[in-house]
Every structure is written in structure tokens, then in C-alpha cells.
């Protein structure tokens, strides 16, 4: 478990413009801190990559409901995995048809995670 006092604050500064295939998602995390410029949802893919998404978008809300439902079936006591379990993230051309340069600002990682191509994270002391 990360130390509560020194836990890193992760912020999303931009969102993916493309839908991630639902079948590629494993979990999600909400970013709601007032210290971040915007609220966000971070999806974690099966490849342990993390992607910032806009919580106001309908597809994001639908995916959250689906993930919650799946999570309740498999882990009744846990709605989503903790930040320490979020291991990585990736460049984004989410339709899986590739050919676009990674957009470094649509993926993220906390300072305790082990990968990401994107959004800045800061530690709040």
C-alpha cells in the first residue's frame, strides 16, 4: 500500500479522443482530486497500460458501469484495483489499426506505477 500522506497525486491533462475496445479493459480509477486541472477516468488495459478518458463522455460512463458489473461478479469486495496495482500505460491509437504516433498526453502513470507514456504525475508532500 502506498503511504497515505506521501501518496502520489496523478493528474490527467488531456483525454483520449478514441474509444478503447471494451474487451481490452481490465479496470479503471477515478481521478477526482481538486489539485488536478480536470476530473478524469483512467482505464487500465489488459496490457497493463493506462489511458486518460473524459468522464463526461457517454462511452466512458458505459464502460465504467460494465467494469463495475464485471468486478462485482469476480471480486465482490473490490470495485476496482488500487493505484499500486496499476502497472503501466501506452501510446494511443485505440482502434487497434495503429499508424498514429503516440499521444503522450492521453496516457498516464502514478509515480509508483511501473509504466506509461503520458500524463504528468506529481507527488504531494
Amino acid at each position: 500500500q502506498p503511504d497515505a500522506v506521501n501518496a502520489p497525486l496523478t493528474c490527467c491533462y488531456s483525454f483520449t479522443s478514441k474509444m478503447i475496445p471494451m474487451s481490452r479493459l481490465e479496470s479503471y480509477k477515478r481521478i477526482t482530486s481538486s489539485r488536478c486541472p480536470k476530473e478524469a477516468v483512467v482505464f487500465v488495459t489488459k496490457l497493463k497500460r493506462e489511458v486518460c478518458a473524459d468522464p463526461k463522455k457517454e462511452w466512458v460512463q458505459t464502460y465504467i458501469k460494465n467494469l463495475d458489473r464485471n468486478q462485482m461478479r469476480s471480486e465482490p469486495t473490490t470495485l476496482f484495483k488500487t493505484a499500486s496495482a496499476l502497472r503501466s500505460s501506452a501510446p494511443l491509437n485505440v482502434k487497434l489499426t495503429r499508424k498514429s504516433e503516440a499521444n503522450a498526453s492521453t496516457t498516464f502513470s502514478t509515480t509508483t506505477s511501473s509504466t506509461s507514456v503520458g500524463v504528468t504525475s506529481v507527488t504531494v508532500n
Epitope: L92, T115, S116
Partner: antibody, heavy 121, light 107 residues
Framework: QVQLVQSGAEVKKPGASVKVSCKAS????????LHWVRQAPGQGLEWMGW????????NYAQKFQGRVTMTRDTSISTAYMELSRLRSDDTAVYYC??????????????WGQGTLVTVSS | DIQMTQSPSSLSASVGDRVTITCQAS??????LNWYQQKPGKAPKLLIY???NLETGVPSRFSGSGSGTDFTFTISSLQPEDIATYYC?????????FGQGTRLEIK
């Protein structure tokens, strides 16, 4: 054009460590994951893990956890793979490979030329 | 881990022949599969991604098909420069895994 240029061949003794470099050019270094894949003599390809050059994040294959460390220096667009506690079965060609893909995919579109690491007493 | 099994492990064919290599995954990977060509002493080269999409610049004689657990890689008319080892690679789940390779020779 995109290029990944790796450091030269190494000969190491069992128990030692080796650090292989991979210098990227021709594209935005921080925009793509770099993976490391190895190939023992006459054998197939084995994925070791990746580094995210944007923030130095890593993800390692469980087989190499605790022995491998992937780092990068963005000022010189170079990634490094260090493997410790070398054994004779670590003798292989080590490749870095760029991943051009998406959050849900992995495609290695450019590869380094490979670095032969020989572990022998 | 997802096991990828290629067959045959080696094959010999004549110039102009149609060549087929198969790759079987130990579990359903939908179409999350790529094919690479590796010539002796060289790094692998991406030929096919997402099971059936031809990488830019790759000759159209190369093709891929399949989904789920069974995949096929085809060279419609073998050329001398196609002598190489071919690998499938899955990315449905970590760790990323490769088939053991199929070595292709000219008769």
C-alpha cells in the same frame, strides 16, 4: 528515418551484470514504448519487458523480475537494459524494438541490430 | 502464459509455391496476433498485424488470416528472398509471447 542502434557485443562471466544500450533517432523518443526481446543461439524470440521513455516506467516479464532493469536517458534518446546475476543460459542476442501500437495492442515496427551477450566462465 | 505453437517447425518449398504456416494459441486471443520475418543474422521484421493486416511496404504475396486460437500465414508465390524464419506473436495478454518459429527453405 527511424533507427535503433545498439551497443556492441559483450562477454561476461557468470554472476556478473551487463548493460546494453539502444540509441533511437528519426522519431520522437518519448512517444513510443521500447521493448527488449532476446534470442538465444538457434532459438526463438523471448519478450523481456518494456520501458516507457516518457516517464521511465517499466513492465517486465515475470521471468526476469528482480534481474532486469530498464532505464532511459531522454537527453540522448537512449534506452538501456541491464541484466544482473548472469547465467550461461542468458547467452543471447538482445534486441530493442519500438512499439508503434495502441493502448490495447503491441506491434514492433522497428528493431535494433541486436547485441550479442555471451556468458562464459 | 499464452503458449503459441507454430507448425511446421521447418519446411522446404520451391520458388512459386504457395506456402502456409499455422500458429495455434493455447487460449482465445481473438485477432491479437502479428507475424514477423527474420532473415539469418538480422532483426525480425513486421509483416502482418492484427492477424490479417499487411504492414506498409510488405509485398502483397504475404497474407494472414484466422481468429480465436487458429491462425494461418500464407505466401502465395514463394520468392528466393523469402528464405527466413517466420514467427507469430500474441499480444492478447502479458507476457507477450512468440511462436517457436518456422524455418523456410528453398528446395
Amino acid at each position: 528515418q527511424v533507427q535503433l542502434v545498439q551497443s556492441g557485443a559483450e562477454v561476461k562471466k557468470p554472476g556478473a551484470s551487463v548493460k546494453v544500450s539502444c540509441k533511437a533517432s528519426g522519431y520522437t523518443f518519448t512517444g513510443y514504448y521500447l521493448h527488449w526481446v532476446r534470442q538465444a543461439p538457434g532459438q526463438g524470440l523471448e519478450w523481456m519487458g518494456w520501458i516507457n521513455p516518457y516517464n521511465d516506467g517499466t513492465n517486465y516479464a515475470q521471468k526476469f523480475q528482480g534481474r532486469v532493469t530498464m532505464t532511459r536517458d531522454t537527453s540522448i534518446s537512449t534506452a538501456y537494459m541491464e541484466l544482473s546475476r548472469l547465467r550461461s543460459d542468458d547467452t543471447a542476442v538482445y534486441y530493442c524494438a519500438r512499439d508503434i501500437a495502441a493502448a490495447g495492442a503491441v506491434y514492433f515496427d522497428y528493431w535494433g541490430q541486436g547485441t550479442l551477450v555471451t556468458v562464459s566462465s | 502464459d499464452i503458449q503459441m505453437t507454430q507448425s511446421p517447425s521447418s519446411l522446404s518449398a520451391s520458388v512459386g509455391d504457395r506456402v502456409t504456416i499455422t500458429c495455434q494459441a493455447s487460449q482465445d486471443i481473438t485477432t491479437y496476433l502479428n507475424w514477423y520475418q527474420q532473415k539469418p543474422g538480422k532483426a525480425p521484421k513486421l509483416l502482418i498485424y492484427d492477424a490479417s493486416n499487411l504492414e506498409t511496404g510488405v509485398p502483397s504475396r504475404f497474407s494472414g488470416s484466422g481468429s480465436g486460437t487458429d491462425f494461418t500465414f500464407t505466401i502465395s508465390s514463394l520468392q528466393p528472398e523469402d528464405i527466413a524464419t517466420y514467427y507469430c506473436q500474441q499480444y492478447d495478454n502479458l507476457p507477450i509471447t512468440f511462436g517457436q518459429g518456422t524455418r523456410l527453405e528453398i528446395k
